[in-house]
């Protein structure tokens, strides 16, 4: 992912990591009634050669990986990103203090891949 | 990108970069007849707060960005990945030396976003 900011260890391969997000931690508790939080998850890890089947790599990611190996200073590796996302339903107050139930798309990471 | 592991400088924002891929450089010239190469492009750049409209961010990416701000050591920023990909047609020799024209999906990056 874009944030391999200061690690000196070997990164694990691209995969889904568990992450619970609390709406209170985000400061959203005053307008979100329910749920109190949700399992958002996130993607992280290396997209290194060879990209195996578990990595859900696109054709472009495979080509980019090969170009990176030839030209690592100018072309980055593909990055580990969500390939499947789910929605969640949220009960919240709108600007007029009405209680609204709304489905928010692309909120939960179900699967990750190299893109 | 995955290799900007320890930088403290500001990277440019997530965007599409031009990249021409030569099939000869990849060592594929013996089986790919045409084209000789193609404009594959790639995505690179920061997915930093705030994620503006140009960054084609998903709801999950927006949430992840906020969690990263609270907890940068454990949760990475979203990564800059293709949001739109195009196919290319390739003329090649198969294992039996037949000439085949095939459309390969997801070969060209048309747009990038934060995921």
């Amino acid at each position: 992912s874009a944030s391999d900011y200061n690690s000196s260890e070997l990164k694990t391969a691209c995969r889904k990591h568990e992450l619970y997000v609390s709406f209170q931690d985000l400061g959203w508790q005053d307008w979100i009634i329910a749920p109190k939080g949700y399992a958002a998850n996130y993607c992280d890890g290396e997209c290194s050669f060879p990209l195996n089947a578990h990595m859900n790599a696109t054709n472009h990611a495979i080509v980019q990986t090969l170009v990176h190996l030839m030209n690592p200073e100018y072309v980055p590796k593909p990055c580990c990103a969500p390939t499947k996302l789910n929605a969640i339903s949220v009960l919240y107050f709108d600007d007029n203090s009405n209680v609204i139930l709304k489905k928010y798309r692309n909120m939960v990471v179900r699967a990750c891949g190299c893109h | 990108s995955a290799s900007d592991y320890n930088s403290s400088e500001l990277k440019t924002a997530c965007r599409k970069h031009e990249l021409y891929v030569s099939f000869q450089d990849l060592g594929w010239q013996d089986w790919i007849i045409a084209p000789k190469g193609y404009a594959a492009n790639y995505c690179d750049g920061e997915c930093s707060f705030p994620l503006n409209a140009h960054m084609n961010a998903t709801n999950h990416a927006i949430v992840q960005t906020l969690v990263h701000l609270m907890n940068p050591e454990y949760v990475p920023k979203p990564c800059c990945a293709p949001t739109k990909l195009n196919a290319i047609s390739v003329l090649y020799f198969d294992d039996n030396s037949n000439v085949i024209l095939k459309k390969y999906r997801n070969m060209v990056v048309r747009a990038c976003g934060c995921h």
Epitope: F49, L66, Y74 | S8, T12
Partner: antibody, heavy 121, light 111 residues
Amino acid sequence: QVQLVESGGGLVKPGGSLRLSCAASGFTFSSYVVHWVRQAPGKGLEWVGRIKDHKQGYTTAYAASVKGRFTISRDDSKNTLYLQMNSLKTEDTAVYYCARVERSKSGFDNWGQGTLVTVSS
Amino acid sequence: QSVLTQPPSVSGAPGQRVTISCTGSSSNIGAGYSVHWYQQLPGTAPKLLIYGSSERPSGVPDRFSGSKSGTSASLAITGLQAEDEADYYCQSWDSSQTLVVFGGGTKLTVL
């Protein structure tokens, strides 16, 4: 033609600081990744670090042996690469080279002549 | 201790063929990264000799060739000449963070 010229080397005491410069000419400096490589007397080449081009946000990386002590920067308007060296140790004594990375296969296709840094009390 | 392993020295008579090996691991050469070779004549800066594992920059004689297989690479010099006497270094990248790695260098002596 492509030219890289290092300067700023000299004698410095342990714990001291020094700033090396590498003046580039004959090419579009801002579009290239550039590195520092050093060579201790009678020894092999050792990678020090690099700074990427403007397109890649000038991101830096360093060898473990210099991380936290050395800082690489560049000024594209002056076509110059810098290496700020702090908390110098005797083992930092070496000829320091700057090198340009060619854009198709990432080889170091042009090197400066080197500048000698001697760390001694 | 260098990440890439080269023999400290090799030698050959004029006209002979010599090879210099460069052995890495699954995190560098074995990860698929290209290998570059540099020639350093006495008292001078290194010069790119082979790039992309097997390609020669313009001006480099075809007596010099490079190859790569698995976790190692090699540089071959045919028709050895006195002016080939120099130090030779291989270079690649480490896949965990795309950091540059060098071999320890090989001193070529022309007998």
